[in-house]
Interface confidence: low
Amino acid sequence: QIHKQEVLPPGLKYGIVLDAGSSRTTVYVYQWPAEKENNTGVVSQTFKCSVKGSGISSYGNNPQDVPRAFEECMQKVKGQVPSHLHGSTPIHLGATAGMRLLRLQNETAANEVLESIQSYFKSQPFDFRGAQIISGQEEGVYGWITANYLMGNFLEKNLWHMWVHPHGVETTGALDLGGASTQISFVAGEKMDLNTSDIMQVSLYGYVYTLYTHSFQCYGRNEAEKKFLAMLLQNSPTKNHLTNPCYPRDYSISFTMGHVFDSLCTVDQRPESYNPNDVITFEGTGDPSLCKEKVASIFDFKACHDQETCSFDGVYQPKIKGPFVAFAGFYYTASALNLSGSFSLDTFNSSTWNFCSQNWSQLPLLLPKFDEVYARSYCFSANYIYHLFVNGYKFTEETWPQIHFEKEVGNSSIAWSLGYMLSLTNQIPAESPLIRLPIEPP
């Protein structure tokens, strides 16, 4: 598909990205001044819409229903972009770990979902650039690009009104938590194994960044919790009624076995007499110490054999370096503990302990936006973050405060979607823009 280069009068340009995650799809609208296309920090998010219902990977059995779910948000998007620009506004859909898992489980179903989406967007007035499943590595890199672009870490204007690479400005590492996967990306120090597929060289504005990025499939918040529930079930003498130390006291929930085990992430933990329709009841005991201990076992830390350059499950990771921004699910969990920005590990631990000690009836008083599905799981998520960051990524009491739990910069969400659009529309050229800008009169 060839996109003809249009000469537009000075004004605004728009771009649309659909982030098709495992648990939901979010539509982002971005805008920037047309005459400043390759400048840094000029793209901003003007609109965000959450598509009602679950993620597109849940439509494997009924792909024809996906477009109907998108309709409400797309109507709103049409109102956000001036109608005369609809035809020249690129729209991209990127699907992440939920679809990566569906593709592994049932490639035909995954393709049918994407085809249904493609035929829907071809009938829309925008310049549809495709619906694709992005890799975990791409998700990590685009998240890192977004965070650093929004923070202005790539270029700055010098005294001669030229864009230059900021001297001595550190980039920020990116920690992203989705529903089905989690990503870590950062510019590592000197000691690095350059032969690993997790190291990549990214060229932005003529500057080469050697980036470590890894995506852990099945370690997103929802899939990690399924692994946890499966582990509780494996270790329980009773198979239909068991306690969950991470659920609040006085809270009880029944799931079918299928809810826990009909995922590629837990298929290996299925009991011998597996029946997806059997019902299991988990009763919360709101037990902070036991929750912390049990959550550790969803990670295989032993596979690292005490090597420093290994996170868990035998995955190579250089020593963490510099500041980090933790966004998406990391931010929402910290926020539930009444924390944001940067804080000590001790503060995180005591907030986790306090939250996990609450009983169910107290949670609506603690959470401004109360939603049962999220509320019951924040204690698990907080302990999951502890083990992931401390025992996995090797953050310590000293380095933990370098993690900033943030949702957005300015009014733009920190999400891989912005980096994705910037790259696909070539808004961050690989070469350095050494064009002298006009000097404004004093």
Partner: antibody, heavy 118, light 110 residues
């Protein structure tokens, strides 16, 4: 192999302070809780408290809260039990043990005998 | 928190079975499937023989088995052997995130 090695026997006078140690090896010391258990001469086992060396989070039995301090130095994979002022009633064998699951201690130290006598 | 209640002594002849009980409350034994049993020979450190009511660590013979009903857990040793003579302690996780031990049972092999 996985083991916990405790410091040697101690003979102390009432009012003195004491810190006994428990060094873990053969496993990820920061990933398991370490518990301390008292056994007075001819008596049963009493759970004193636990520590999570990964972040030094502690939990004490109400009977021992304020009487002892449990700490850890993860850089040397060692947990400690200390008293600021010993009494004759502190005479006992003290065991450290690794907690595997809820309250199940799968690996035990050899024990440290503490004798407090004037 | 009160210690769990165990009989002070139990006995049996070689080859026989013996059962030791451990009674607590709904806040410990009755509330959780987290009952453990330990064997302690004189002058030695305790050894874990059962955890989570019924599970045996590797190396523990299947002559040792556990069960639980209500607020009472039980340890059964079948095919009693001379080396089984020891003190046996139960323990349970509690609702206050602590652990409580039983008073101990001295097992004599006649």
């Amino acid at each position: 192999q996985v083991q916990l090695v405790q410091s040697g026997a101690e003979v102390k006078k009432p009012g003195e302070s004491l810190k006994i140690s428990c060094k873990g090896s053969g496993y990820s010391f920061t990933s398991y809780w370490i518990g301390w258990v008292r056994q007075m001469p001819g008596k049963g086992l009493e759970w004193m408290g636990i520590i999570y060396p990964g972040d030094s989070g502690t939990r004490y039995s109400p009977s021992f809260q304020g009487q002892v301090t449990i700490s850890a130095d993860k850089s040397i994979s060692t947990a400690y039990l200390q008293w600021s002022s010993l009494k004759a009633s502190n005479t006992a064998m003290y065991y450290c043990a690794r907690q595997q699951g809820a309250g199940a201690f799968d690996i035990w130290g050899q024990g440290t005998m503490v004798t407090v006598s004037s | 928190q009160s210690a769990l209640t165990q009989p002070p002594s139990a006995s049996g002849s070689p080859g026989q079975s013996v059962t030791i009980s451990c009674t607590g409350t709904s806040r410990d034994v009755g509330g959780y499937n987290y009952v453990s049993w330990y064997q302690q020979h004189p002058g030695k450190a305790p050894k874990l023989i059962l955890y989570e009511v019924t599970k045996r660590p590797s190396g523990v013979p299947d002559r040792f088995s556990g069960s639980k009903s209500g607020n009472t857990a039980s340890l059964t040793i079948s095919g009693l052997q001379a080396e089984d003579e020891a003190d046996y302690y139960c323990s349970s996780y509690t609702s206050s995130s602590t652990v409580v031990f039983g008073g101990g049972t001295k097992l004599t092999v006649l």
